[in-house]
Amino acid sequence: ELCDDDPPEIPHATFKAMAYKEGTMLNCECKRGFRRIKSGSLYMLCTGNSSHSSWDNQCQCTSSATRNTTKQVTPQPEEQKERKTTEMQSPMQPVDQASLPGHCREPPPWENEATERIYHFVVGQMVYYQCVQGYRALHRGPAESVCKMTHGKTRWTQPQLICTGEMETSQFPGEEKPQASPEGRPESETSCLVTTTDFQIQTEMAATMETSIFTTEYQ
């Protein structure tokens, strides 16, 4: 089941998926001056069986000016620079795919890919948020959002991250910073059954993501 909306935006924060649930689609978009090859796929699809998930189809772009097809290669470093979508830095790489059954990793870039990746997420997908450079987390409750099915409709949970540019905040004396609680909201908050995610194991990682960079855009 595809999620109806985009994940919520948080002021002065960006979000990124660590891995993508089976059923996720990534549009094959090309940068200006390029187009999909005639016989090319419209999108890549995360598919798999119980033991292995991978992206079906390959995105291929060709120059709008020429009719011949292009070869599928990894961009050169200088081409990579113009992409807005950056991979997580190595310490923040998602848990190994094998330990996340039913999920695909970030697809590798393709030649002349558009600067913005447009994903179509499915129920159970989780995305993680962090404050952008120059802002810090005033409050870091659950810094993630999950696409859930509630009353037959999909909805993203609201991340409880507040990013502030104000450096002068008051911290009351004599109080140690408590640990963020991993259990999230209790079931008593929802009035009917919701579809939850099997992606809980990423929660610990989310709390340590402050130094990582992610700027992929989603839709």
Epitope: H139, Q158, P159, Q160, I162, S181, E183, R185
Partner: antibody, heavy 115, light 107 residues
């Protein structure tokens, strides 16, 4: 179910301080920041500030800077708002509200400042 | 600080009417806007968050739209229990200011 229960009404003299409490239940208290909002009689809503129930960091509206102190006690899942140097214009209903989108509110605490 | 201006300040309507309240921000606030309903002697209640998402348990006759600086709260068919005061508020940056309110009265 989620509940924010505030302390009872207070009558204070000008120059005094008042401390209003807000106890959260039915959810994980440290997951959600707590905001404080007040409403003078017949007036609109005025945001006073926000405190992280996780770290204790707080940001106050400029208007209340130096007079307001927000604290939390995670052991009792309670947030506090203390307003000092009270004047008659501080007569209002004070509310606590939970999270980024103020999805749950306390019932309000009436503070009357009168000589 | 970001100023939030609601219009109209008050509004008379009848049960079954379609009602629209607007809120304008003094600068671009993307979709970081909430709508609240308040009845006399009661705490405000969240209706819409992130400009267009209906809060849990809120009837579908309420809807929100807009982005940037101009936002709208629409009640498609007014019910007797909808007569109240409505406030918009942004959460783009502190201070999180509110609109001055729109009082919806029975005609």
């Amino acid at each position: 179910q989620v509940q924010l229960v505030q302390s009872g009404a207070e009558v204070k003299k000008p120059g005094a301080s008042v401390k209003v409490s807000c106890k959260g239940s039915g959810y994980t208290f440290t997951d959600y920041a707590m905001h404080w909002v007040r409403q003078a009689p017949g007036q609109g809503l005025e945001w006073m500030g926000v405190i992280s129930t996780y770290s204790g960091d707080a940001i106050y509206a400029q208007k209340f800077q130096g007079r307001v102190t927000m604290t939390v006690d995670t052991s009792t899942s309670t947030a506090y708002m203390e307003l000092s140097s009270l004047r008659s214009e501080d007569t209002a209903v004070y509310y606590c509200a939970r999270g980024v989108t103020f999805d749950y509110w306390g019932q309000g605490t009436t503070v009357t400042v009168s000589s | 600080d970001i100023q939030m201006t609601q219009s109209p300040s008050s509004l008379s309507a009848s049960v079954g009417d379609r009602v629209t309240i607007t809120c304008r921000a003094s600068q671009d606030i993307s979709n970081y806007l909430e709508w609240y309903q308040q009845k006399p002697g009661k705490a405000p209640k969240l209706l819409i968050y992130n400009a267009k998402t209906l809060a849990e348990g809120v009837p579908s006759r309420f809807s929100g739209s807009g982005s940037g600086t101009d936002f709208t709260l629409t009640i498609s068919s007014l019910q007797p229990e909808d007569f109240a005061t409505y406030y918009c508020q942004h959460h783009y940056d502190t201070p999180y200011t509110f609109g001055q309110g729109t009082k919806l009265e029975i005609k």
